[in-house]
């Protein structure tokens, strides 16, 4: 013979327990039926009448099998640093978490409580560890041959090119600047032509052609977005 | 508007029976998920609770005093009753009726009636 | 059976200020506790349910807070109104009260 099933509420064996999605009450001391993701408890079991559920009101919820009197509320609205990554609806909690930029400096059990701006290297200090979702970035001053001209979140110090004949010598926050060796073709007055420099940059940087000057015209130093380091958030 | 009333004899001998009744408007038994239970307080002492009693005539009983308490009830009259044999000294207190509804909680109480135990 | 230690039996306070008492059970009771005011001649009168929710037309100087097993409940701004017997109630596992505490003001 099939083993009869039992509905709830019933009396568990000695020793046993109670089935998924039925918890054990010891007031009735009977297995009752729990409450589903957005519902809670609205009259509890019994010994002959099971628990009886009700929708979570707006703004509240239960994520979990339950039999709680009362949802949980969800949390507060995100802060305008934030991002909400997860709507409250009467089965899961809002989420808040950073936006591009920035980096949670308080977490709570899901998403973040506090938001804090990622620190930006100055010139002459580069990304030694990249931000991350919970933590902030860190900077150290370029070692020698390598610069950063940025006040960036994201920028590594790079290895300074490296000239046949320099005309001015790199140092922390800023690239060596080259003399052409080879013959400029004739330029229109003030243009300035950009000749391949020996060695190319690290991999994290795409190579940036070192600028070249007629005699007697002033330098002209290349300023522009490098991109962001692996693993970094962009703004 | 919800309302209990406790009503008693007053006064009882040692190992007579206590026969109480608790009247309540504003509510019926017939209505799901509501009860009406018992919970005394002795002369300068706290709460204690003794039984109540479902709108499905399910009954729970204080372990350390259920062989002594029967508690029932007319639905049609809004009433509920309590019995309490072989009272003894220990049994004087004030004796309360008191609403429970669906999540277990005593919501609304009568004024109490007083119960002297002497010989 | 759950057993509970109210604490204190008695205390006083001065008015306007604030009056903590304290309920711990002998196991887990889920946060199904409540708090109760009772007054001389009176039934006692429901505050707080499910550790911190106040009922209908409570109002909120009165507060609950705890869970597992030390539960808390708070006055604050005392009024001269709320001279009562305060008692716990836990209705995790039949129901039993605390053995409250007498609020007096100074």
């Known amino acids: 013979l099939p083993a009869q099933v039992a509905f709830t509420p019933y009396a568990p064996e000695p020793g046993g327990t109670c089935r998924l999605r039925e918890y054990y009450d010891q007031t009735a001391q009977m297995c009752c039926s729990k409450c589903p993701p957005g519902q809670h408890a609205k009259v509890f079991c019994t010994k002959t009448s099971d628990t009886v559920c009700d929708s979570c009101e707006d703004s509240t919820y239960t994520q979990l099998w339950n039999w709680v009197p009362e949802c949980l509320s969800c949390g507060s609205r995100c802060s305008s640093d934030q991002v909400e990554t997860q709507a409250c609806t009467r089965e899961q909690n809002r989420i808040c978490t950073c936006r591009p930029g920035w980096y949670c400096a308080l977490s709570k059990q899901e998403g973040c409580r506090l938001c804090a701006q990622l620190r930006k290297c100055r010139p002459g200090f580069g990304v030694a560890r990249p931000g991350t979702e919970t933590s902030d970035v860190v900077c150290k001053p370029c070692a020698p041959g390598t610069f950063s001209n940025t006040t960036s979140s994201t920028d590594i110090c790079r290895p300074h090119q490296i000239c046949h004949v320099v005309a001015i010598p790199g140092n922390a926050s800023m690239d060596a600047v080259c003399t052409s060796t080879s013959p400029t073709r004739s330029m229109a007055p003030g243009a300035v032509h950009l000749p391949q420099p020996v060695s190319t940059r690290s991999q994290h940087t795409q190579p940036t052609p070192a600028p070249s000057t007629a005699p007697g015209t002033s330098f002209l130093l290349p300023v522009g977005p490098s991109p962001p380091a692996e693993g970094s958030t962009g703004d | 508007q919800v309302t209990l009333k406790e009503s008693g004899p007053g006064i009882l001998q040692p190992s007579q029976t206590l026969s109480l009744t608790c009247s309540f408007s504003?509510?019926?038994?017939?209505?799901?998920?509501?009860?009406v239970g018992w919970i005394r307080q002795p002369s300068g002492k706290g709460l204690e609770w003794l039984t109540h009693?479902?709108?499905?005539?399910?009954?729970y009983y204080n372990p350390a005093l259920k062989s002594r308490l029967t508690i029932s009830r007319d639905t049609s009259e809004n009433l509920v009753f309590l019995k309490i044999a072989n009272v003894d000294t220990a049994d004087t207190a004030t004796y309360y009726c008191?609403?429970?509804?669906?999540?277990?909680?005593?919501?609304?109480w009568g004024q109490g009636t007083t119960l002297t135990v002497s010989s | 059976d759950i057993q509970m230690t109210q604490s204190p039996s008695s205390l006083s306070a001065s008015l306007g200020g604030k009056v903590t008492i304290t309920c711990k059970t002998s196991q887990d009771i889920n946060k199904f506790i409540a708090w109760y005011q009772h007054k001389p001649g009176k039934g006692p009168r429901l505050l707080i349910h499910y550790t911190s929710t106040l009922q209908p037309g409570i109002p909120s100087r009165f507060s609950g807070s705890g869970s597992g097993r030390d539960y808390s409940f708070s006055i604050s701004d005392l009024e001269p109104e709320d001279i009562a017997t305060y008692y716990c109630?836990?209705?995790?596992?039949?129901?039993?009260f605390g053995g409250g505490t007498k609020l007096e003001i100074k």
């Open positions: 109630l836990q209705y995790a596992n039949l129901w039993a």
């Open positions: 504003g509510f019926s038994l017939n209505t799901f998920g509501l009860g």
């Open positions: 009693i479902w709108w499905n005539d399910d009954k």
């Open positions: 008191a609403r429970i509804e669906g999540l277990r909680r005593f919501d609304y």
